[in-house]
């Protein structure tokens, strides 16, 4: 079995972190996906995942987390917006495939949140925006739960991170949709 | 419909251990991880720690690190607790409870508690 | 570790009249989904506690609209508009923002 491993970024208060998690095109394409974060004793907690199934390029936005699946490129794009010191830990990306255990997108992202604010380039400024502002929701029943195994028996593809500048605002390029999460209640 | 049954009441001498065991049915015992809460007489609720019932991983309460031990067996989907070096602080009702699917963590079905008496 | 801490301590309710409790953590129990990692439970004497609400504000199945809960990053309400006499017990916030803890608990009780 492989041993999981993992990247680290390192990030300033306000900034975004921007992750890519690659996966076989062809085999996982159209299945749900979701980032988590790893608490104490290997004990993922599902923050956000696409829908079921997955939509191709389709923006979904839960709080501060943004996910948008790349199906023609392999792809799953998290972005986590205005980063606070308490986001700092250990996430990973899942594909799930119930009722299998979540197969898992490597590497790791350790992410480490400091004080203070580090300016980087902004994003270009010749693309068509939209800007959404998208209020925290919540629905019980959509993201499973599938506990995560501890180790994998193929060599991970990796997983890239960017930063880009803070904002109050979220802007996604070129969308004409976004997904809202339901309200349950 | 979901359950789930805990051993019996206990009694027990300080110094020694006790193993309390939880059994599950009417859901996927592997899909939901498994918290230990216990209550001390006249007490509130204290969290011990939580199983991943698919892996066997755990994760323990600080006060409880390396005393308290959390298995798992999954072709009998139950979950055991085990407490060591007991004292009469331990004296407690003993709860597993499911820990709920998906964004939810809370606590949705709680076993009927399992008495655990430390006296000499 | 984040301290819960709940008031009062013990509350003595007329059915029919609103009740409403408390709970304070030491940190903020929003997460970046944003949602916060705030359960409300009910355990009624000489039972095993119940989830009445999760995630700060949705009511748990089954549980009675009466029952509502309130409150973002540090500071949590649970309200109960018109109390009935079935609802007394001790209620219990429990955050899972980091680890899990609960608060001491606040007995209801009828006048």
């Known amino acids: 079995a492989t041993k999981l491993t993992e990247e680290k970024y390192e990030l300033k208060e306000g900034q975004t972190l921007d992750v890519k998690c690659d996966y076989t095109l062809e085999k996982f394409a159209s299945s749900q996906k979701a980032w988590q974060i790893i608490r104490d004793g290997e004990m993922p907690k599902t923050l956000a995942c696409t829908e079921r199934p997955s939509k191709n390029s389709h923006p979904v936005q839960v709080g501060r987390i943004i996910l948008e699946d790349y199906h023609d490129h392999g792809l799953l794009r998290v972005r986590m917006v205005n980063l606070q010191v308490e986001d700092s830990g250990l996430y990973q990306c899942v594909i799930y495939q119930p009722p299998k255990e979540p197969h898992m997108l490597f590497d790791r992202i350790r992410l480490v949140v400091t004080k203070g604010f580090s300016g980087t380039p902004g994003s270009n400024e010749n693309s068509t925006q939209n800007v959404y502002k998208i209020p925290p929701t919540t629905t019980k029943a959509l993201c499973p739960l599938y506990t995560s195994p501890r180790t994998v028996t193929q060599a991970p593809p990796k997983s890239t991170a960017d930063v880009s500048t803070p904002d109050s605002e979220i802007n996604l390029t070129n969308v004409t949709d976004i997904i809202r999460v339901p309200v349950f209640n | 419909q979901v359950q789930l049954v805990q051993s019996g009441a206990e009694v027990k001498k300080p110094g020694a251990s006790v193993k309390v065991s939880c059994k599950a049915s009417?859901?996927?015992?592997?899909?939901?991880?498994m918290h230990w809460v216990r209550q001390a007489p006249g007490q509130g609720l204290e969290w011990m720690g939580v199983i991943n019932p698919s892996g066997g991983s755990t994760s323990y309460a600080q006060k409880f690190q390396g005393r308290v031990t959390m298995t798992r067996d999954t072709s009998t989907s139950t979950v055991y607790m085990e407490l060591s070096s007991l004292r009469s602080e331990d004296t407690a009702v003993y709860y597993c409870?499911?820990?709920?699917?998906?964004?939810?963590?809370?606590?949705?079905?709680w076993g009927q508690g399992t008495t655990v008496t430390v006296s000499s | 570790d984040i301290v819960m801490t709940q008031s009062p301590l013990s509350l003595p309710v007329t059915p029919g009249e609103p009740a409403s409790i408390s709970c304070r953590s030491s940190q903020s129990l929003l997460h970046s989904n944003g949602y916060n990692y705030l359960d409300w439970y009910l355990q009624k004497p000489g039972q095993s506690p119940q989830v009445l609400i999760y995630?700060?504000?949705n009511r748990a199945s089954g549980v009675p609209d009466r029952f509502s809960g309130s409150g973002s990053g540090t500071d949590f309400t649970l309200k109960i508009s018109r109390v009935e006499a079935e609802d007394v017990g001790v209620y219990y916030c429990?955050?899972?923002?980091?680890?899990?803890?609960f608060g001491g608990g606040t007995k209801v009780e009828i006048k």
């Open positions: 409870a499911r820990e709920g699917s998906g964004y939810d963590e809370s606590m949705d079905v």
């Open positions: 995630l700060g504000s």
């Open positions: 429990m955050q899972a923002r980091h680890g899990f803890t």
């Open positions: 009417g859901y996927t015992f592997t899909s939901y991880y």
